[in-house]
């Protein structure tokens, strides 16, 4: 109970007659009734609804106020809807008035109405019709009013009826103080309320056992003049390894943990982890399972993946394409990537050494997210072993043997590398003479060179080719004053090399008989 009520009067608690003063005697009437739980109670009722100008007063006995300064009056009453009473619409009312009178002693049985101070006019939130009568769900209205600060030793309460049909079921008079409570895992002691209606007393709370103050947010509450704790500021939270149970912090049980005071409650240890004591702030991984440094404590412990499956290869001279299926077991993680280890082997000794850095991997050698790779620039007629390893976030933490899929292959003859150093030797109106250098890596005997050329405007929609065995050639039958694009590639028994970069050459205009060397209009490094 957050608000401690110190009772000064409780009509419901009285079994004998209340014997309050009724004036006139024909007005308010004390009767025995039953409350909503069929418990016998003493009530006062009045239903003088037929005559106008009613003025029926009911006064309590003298009430000593004790230490109170502000007094609360709680009224429980039922009020009958005037519409449910036949023929009384002009005279029936649906409110009554509440008064008080302060004195230092009991002044006797006379009600001196002019001395009483009006507290309020009381209206029902819910009145009831004849159809509701007697059903004990009698639409009991509860109204609370306050008086004070009081200066005398006691007071009377009075109820003025002006022509309503009312039963006063309960009158409770009390004052309040803030009762010791535990709020937000902080203990706040009994606190006397402030004397002023608007005053708030700030109280600092103390964290319960195994709790700590939230960072820079120490628990405080305010005790209002109404005896209510208001405006909780800050809080305590259960330490790591403890969770809130009601107003206490209890240790996490075995197989449970709480890693931070910021977490609300203990969680079951994630898969493949355990805690064998109470109050654990983290769970240890089982043998063979690990947590990556970036893994939060709430994720399962995981292990390295198994080897990739169904590794297949395809050799094209000195290029090998590898493809595989994901591992059967990803170790419980979604961050599986692949890395390729290339070894060049000599079958005679059976020894293998890592491939050099001049090998190309497409798209890359490590951190592969897709399950394929192309290995390029291998030596022709050489033996290679490729190991494909699946890797995840805990692979580097494991001390157990690497798991990989391997394949051994022998490369074929390679096609030649790209022709370089293409030059314009002569440019005429209808012919261009070009020269070039042999590829750096012929990878065999070059049988011929193939020159591809086309008008630049045609954008390779139609092109012509010219074959030659030497490293120079004259291309004839060209149009004057036209820009041509030239590309050259070498040919061996193993196949075609890549085309050289594009070379743009403009033939001479027809009107000019003068011969000169044309300059390149543009050149492009990307091979076609």
């Amino acid at each position: 109970q957050a608000a401690k009520e110190v009772l000064l009067l409780d009509s419901k608690a009285q079994q004998t007659e209340l014997e309050w003063i009724s004036s006139p005697p024909s007005g308010w009437e004390e009767i025995s009734g039953l409350d909503e739980n069929y418990t016998p109670i003493r009530t006062y009722q009045v239903c003088q609804v037929m005559e106008p100008n009613q003025n029926n007063w009911l006064r309590t006995n003298w009430i000593s106020k004790g230490n109170a300064q502000r007094i609360f009056v709680e009224l429980k009453f039922t009020l009958r809807d005037c519409n449910s009473l036949p023929g009384v619409l002009g005279t029936c009312k649906e409110t009554f008035n509440l008064y008080y009178y302060e004195t230092d002693y009991d002044t006797g049985r006379n009600i001196r109405e002019n001395l009483y101070v009006k507290i309020d006019t009381i209206a029902a939130d819910e009145s009831f019709t004849q159809g509701d009568l007697g059903e004990r769900k009698m639409k009991l209205n509860t109204e609370v009013r306050e008086i004070g600060p009081l200066s005398k030793k006691g007071f009377y309460l009075a109820f003025q009826d002006v022509g309503a049909c009312i039963a006063l079921v309960s009158v409770k008079v009390y004052y309040k103080k803030c009762w010791s409570i535990v709020e937000n895992l902080a203990v706040f002691p009994d606190t006397v309320t402030g004397s002023e209606f608007s005053s708030l007393v700030e109280v600092r709370g103390t964290c319960v056992s195994s709790a700590e103050e939230e960072a820079e947010n120490s628990p405080r509450m305010h005790c209002s003049a109404e005896g209510e704790w208001l405006v909780p500021i800050g809080k305590c939270i259960c330490k790591a390894g403890y969770q809130q149970k009601g107003d206490t912090c209890e240790p996490c049980g075995r197989r449970f943990y709480k890693s931070s005071s910021q977490d609300l409650q203990c969680s079951r240890c994630p898969t493949h982890s355990f805690s064998d004591r109470e109050g654990s702030s983290r769970c240890e991984c089982e043998d063979g399972y690990y947590r990556a440094p970036s893994d939060p404590p709430y994720v399962a412990c995981t292990r390295p993946p198994s080897a990739p499956q169904n590794l297949i290869f395809n050799i094209n001279q000195t290029t090998v394409s590898l493809e595989w299926s994901p591992p059967a077991d990803n170790g419980g993680r979604n961050d599986v990537t692949y890395r390729i280890l290339c070894k060049r082997c000599s079958w005679e000794q059976g020894e293998c050494v890592p491939c050099g850095s001049n090998i190309g991997y497409m798209p890359q050698q490590t951190g592969l997210e897709d399950n394929y790779v192309t290995v390029m620039d291998l030596l022709a007629h050489a033996n290679y072993t490729f190991e494909v390893e699946a890797v995840n976030g805990v692979s580097d933490l494991s001390r157990s043997q690497r798991l990989f899929a391997a394949v051994s292959i022998t490369t074929g003859q390679a096609a030649p590398s790209q022709v370089s150093g293409v030059m314009k030797e002569r440019v005429l109106q209808r012919s261009v003479q070009l020269s070039w250098q042999e590829p750096e890596h012929p990878n065999g005997v070059i049988t011929e060179y193939e020159i591809k050329y086309y008008e630049k405007d045609q954008r390779e929609r139609t092109y012509s080719t010219l074959k030659t065995k030497s490293t120079s050639a004259s291309i004839n039958n060209l149009k004057p004053g036209t820009v041509y694009v030239f590309q050259i590639r070498a040919v061996t028994a193993a196949g075609y090399g890549n085309y050289s970069p594009r070379l743009d050459v403009a033939t001479l205009e027809e009107a000019s008989g003068k011969m000169f060397e044309a300059t390149a209009v543009s050149s492009e490094q990307n091979p076609v």
Epitope: G33, L34, C47, V49, G87, V88, Q130, G131, L133, I166
Partner: antibody, heavy 121, light 106 residues
């Protein structure tokens, strides 16, 4: 002491009229409605209707309209039941009864001693 | 109009025994029901109103309950002065009485 006083027995011929008085004492007459109830010899109770003693407004039950009239004289705190064109079947004890409205329900809490009206030729 | 049917018509009990009287309405009257006692040669007396609330001065051996269409008046231990006719009465827009139950000495 709250009481309702009715007149003594009346013997009337068919077709005649009778006016039964009901004098209230011990409370404010205009603060409570007045009901009329009929009881034929050896029979049960029949509610005839009621009158608002403050406004004089009457309400008649089914079967008691036309020949039956409720009236008041508040100066002498008396309610009246007048029956005209009397018939033999009007022979009965006629009770006036004070109506009590309360929060918890209504009822007729104070009764007159009854007036026996006999209709006979 | 609402018809009230009381049962039994006559109830024979010995003093000190329990008596249970029933009143059934032809349609719901909520809790708008009163009970009256009438002794021979006397005017009726209000016992209960609001289906279950005692009128002033009524002994607590009388109790009543019910709402809607079914109501009961109970005399826990019948005293000699309780032998009489008992009527239920509903008060809606129009008021009606039941035909009565006679409680007689067995």
């Amino acid at each position: 002491q709250v009481q309702l006083l009715q007149s003594g027995a009346e013997v009337k011929k068919p077709g005649a009229s009778v006016k039964v008085p009901c004098k209230a004492s011990g409370y404010t007459f205009t603060s409570r409605a007045m009901s009329w109830v009929r009881q034929a010899p050896g029979q049960g109770l029949e509610w005839m209707g009621w009158i608002n003693t403050n406004t004089g407004n009457p309400t008649y039950a089914q079967g008691f309209t036309g020949r039956f009239v409720f009236s008041l004289d508040t100066s002498v705190s008396t309610a009246y039941l007048q029956i005209s064109s009397l018939k033999a079947e009007d022979t009965a004890v006629y009770y006036c009864a004070r109506v009590r409205f309360t929060v918890y329900g209504d009822g007729m809490d104070v009764w007159g001693q009854g007036t026996l009206v006999t209709v006979s030729s | 109009e609402i018809v009230l049917t009381q049962s039994p018509a006559t109830l024979s009990v010995s003093p000190g025994e329990r008596a249970t009287l029933s009143c059934r309405a032809s349609q719901s009257v909520s809790s708008n029901l009163a009970w009256y006692q009438q002794k021979p040669g006397q005017a009726p007396r209000l016992l209960i109103y609001g289906a279950s609330t005692w009128a002033t001065g009524i002994p607590d051996r009388f109790s009543a309950s019910g709402s809607g269409t079914d109501f009961t008046l109970t005399i826990s231990r019948v005293e000699p002065e309780d032998f009489a006719v008992y009527y239920c009465q509903q008060y809606g827009p129009s008021w009606t009485f039941g035909q009565g139950t006679k409680v007689e000495i067995k």
